[in-house]
């Protein structure tokens, strides 16, 4: 075929042409060149920059038998789903013997209806707290203007007119949805519906009442739940452990706490089945028929000693001459607290009762007035705590010590009148 | 608005010439590749010749091969298919016609045509 | 040379039909077939090109589709206006060619 300079000619028959649509398009881009010889490789260019991973194929078709006949090229280049970073100036580029040849330019642009970026999400708030719901949309074309819903019912006259990308909400005292619109010129789209539920705010002002050694009373002060009545509010109590470090705000305790339910009205707690001179930490929830409220902080509370339930075991009380030895053991019973010591009396049978702070130790040694001739002597011990005085053991005669002989020791006759105390763990 | 108008048919004798003229107005003429299409009598559609907006690169089918050429005058944005040693098979309606931007071999405007009569 | 076969020359069609016209390659044309159409008197006008892209002002009733060596060119709704002969071309490699046309005509 008769051809001019044609070097200097580009030998691109078929130039990239335009795509303009919605996001999720799939569209085609093709260059077709008609050269003499071997067939270049065609490169494809986005805005000047060669596309590595371009997803293209070439084709290739002699037009001839002979090696220097002419060769049609094609380059199709797919765009799978359109999406904005796919926008841009497209172009084709061959390397011709010393020459580069450049394709003229085709254009993918974006034009549909707004696109969002973000979007209102599910959440809880507390009843008559302000909070902030975000919404964020795109074209082109540009400009998007959003319009917020509340309960399907505008926030604005008109698009754009209200509150664009952050919609802050002074307070609800009902669950309620929220979405927004996003206008632009070819149309309208509507983000997800968000729900915002309403739960009751947090209680105030959990305080003790009272305080027993197994038992501690407590109240608070119940926070706005919106229009949905209160069910319910839930204390739960943990034993305090110097390792554990419960502060407000910190994650749970590892251990299980203990967990209570009150009835609302009134708010107020009698919490049993404590230790006795235990630090505790407590917090409360209340509920509605939307869910809970966020848990107060961790209030460390502590139950007060007691005194000891049982008396010391294993009294021996034996009689030399004018000295008398009695022995004991640490009550069985819980001490209630911590023992700051004992309490012995005797007595014998026509005088005044003797009584004596003996302390932590548990054996004494008394020397007995006179020749020793007080008949029916008899001798009672007592722990006792912070608190006060434990039971009183029961009566033990004093008895004369034989040598030879080992200590008579003496049972209790009597157990004490409320069986040793066992522990729920929880 | 794009247009084409071919001048230059008539009636002819076999082994005779022509030059037919393609005047266009409307584009930037010279962005463009340009192609001749004729029809027969029968309604036939047959491709005559392919130039490139440089004029550098032209293209005939191997029926025309050396008896027609094609050129063109940017400066004067004008077409020209000299046709000699022509035969009875060339009588046909002439088009010119313009090349899309994304296939030139596609042609996305037509002139309304001359007629050329090949016969004694 | 690349053959471009419009089996029909003729197809009747009733107002409002859908109808397709075919046109067969003779070998793979990487879908570059162009679709044209002549009403008496006129010179031919554009209305496809790369087998599916539509020329601008063309009526959206008229879609092109196919791949490989087979192409179609649908009108959804026949108008009246639409009464014409029907080309395919292949503008994938010189020499240019053509179909032998489809004339659409009413029932």
């Known amino acids: 075929a008769p051809r001019g300079t044609q070097a200097e000619e580009s030998p691109f028959v078929g130039n990239p042409g335009n795509i303009t649509g919605a996001r999720g398009l799939t569209g085609t881009l093709r260059c077709q060149l008609q050269v003499q010889g071997e067939p270049p490789e065609v490169h494809w260019l986005r805005d000047g920059q060669i596309l590595e991973l371009a997803d293209s194929t070439q084709t290739q078709v002699p037009l001839g038998e002979d090696e220097q006949d002419d060769w049609i090229v094609v380059s199709q280049l797919r765009i799978t789903s359109l999406q904005l970073s796919d926008t841009g100036q497209y172009q084709c580029l061959v390397f011709l013997g010393h020459q580069t040849f450049v394709s003229q330019p085709g254009y993918v642009g974006l034009e549909g209806l707004p696109y969002f970026l973000e979007e209102p999400e599910d959440r809880t708030v507390a009843a008559n707290t302000p909070f902030n719901l975000s919404c964020q949309a795109q074209g082109p074309p540009e400009p998007v203007d959003l319009l917020w819903l509340q309960d399907a019912v505008p926030l604005a006259t008109a698009p754009g007119h209200g509150p664009q990308r952050s919609l802050h909400v002074p307070g609800l005292n009902k669950t309620s949805s929220f979405s927004c619109e996003a206008h632009n010129a070819k149309g309208v789209t509507t983000s997800r519906t968000a729900t915002i539920t309403v739960l009751p705010q947090q209680p105030r002002n959990l305080h003790l009442v009272s305080r027993q050694p197994t038992e501690l009373e407590v109240a608070w002060t119940p926070g706005l739940s919106g229009i949905y009545p209160l069910t319910h509010c839930t204390l739960q109590a943990v034993l305090s452990d110097d390792g554990m470090g419960i502060q407000a705000g910190e994650p749970d305790p590892p251990e299980e706490p203990l967990t209570s339910q009150a009835s609302v009205p009134p708010h107020q707690l009698r919490l049993g089945s404590l230790h006795p001179h235990t630090p505790y930490h407590i917090r409360v929830a209340c509920t509605s028929s939307q869910g809970p409220s966020s848990w107060t902080h961790w209030l460390p509370v502590e139950t007060p000693e007691g005194v000891p339930l049982g008396p010391p075991e294993n009294i021996s009380a034996t009689r030399n001459g004018s000295q008398a030895f009695v022995h004991w053991q640490e009550p069985r019973a819980p001490l209630q607290g911590t023992l700051l010591g004992y309490r012995l009396a005797y007595q014998g049978q026509d005088t005044p009762e003797v009584l004596m702070d003996i302390g932590l130790r548990q054996e004494v040694t008394l020397e007995l007035q006179g020749d020793g001739s007080v008949s029916n002597l008899t001798v009672c011990v007592a722990a006792y705590t912070a608190a006060g005085d434990g039971p009183w053991s029961l009566p033990v005669p004093l008895e004369a010590w034989r040598p030879g002989q080992a200590q008579p020791v003496h049972q209790l006759v009597k157990e004490p009148s409320t069986p040793a105390f066992s522990w729920p763990w929880w | 608005e794009v247009k084409l108008v071919e001048s230059g048919g008539g009636l002819v004798q076999p082994g005779g010439s022509l030059k037919l003229s393609c005047a266009a107005s409307?584009?930037?003429?010279?962005?463009?590749?340009m192609s001749w299409v004729r029809q027969t009598p029968e309604k036939r559609l047959e491709w005559v010749a392919y130039?490139?907006?440089?004029?550098?690169?032209?293209y005939y089918p191997d029926t025309i091969k050396g008896r027609f050429t094609l050129s063109r005058d940017n400066d004067r944005n004008t077409l020209y298919l000299q046709m000699s040693s022509l035969k009875s098979e060339d009588t046909a309606m002439y088009y010119c016609?313009?090349?899309?931007?994304?296939?030139?071999?596609?042609?996305?405007?037509w002139g309304q045509g001359t007629s050329v009569t090949v016969s004694s | 040379d690349i053959v471009m076969t419009q089996s029909h020359k003729f197809m009747s069609t009733s107002l409002g039909d859908r109808i397709s016209i075919t046109c067969k390659a003779s070998q793979d044309v990487i879908t570059a077939v162009a679709w044209y159409q002549q009403k008496p008197g006129q010179s031919p006008k554009l209305l496809i090109y790369w087998a599916s892209t539509r020329h601008t002002g063309v009526p959206d009733r008229f879609t092109g589709s196919g791949s490989g060596t087979d192409y179609n060119l649908t009108i959804s709704s026949v108008q009246a206006e639409d009464l014409a002969l029907y080309y395919c071309?292949?503008?994938?490699?010189?020499?240019?060619?053509f179909g032998a046309g489809t004339k659409l005509e009413l029932k």
């Open positions: 130039i490139s907006n440089g004029g550098g690169r032209t």
């Open positions: 071309q292949q503008h994938f490699s010189t020499p240019l060619t």
């Open positions: 409307g584009f930037t003429f010279n962005s463009y590749s």
């Open positions: 016609a313009r090349g899309t931007t994304e296939s030139y071999y596609a042609l996305d405007y």
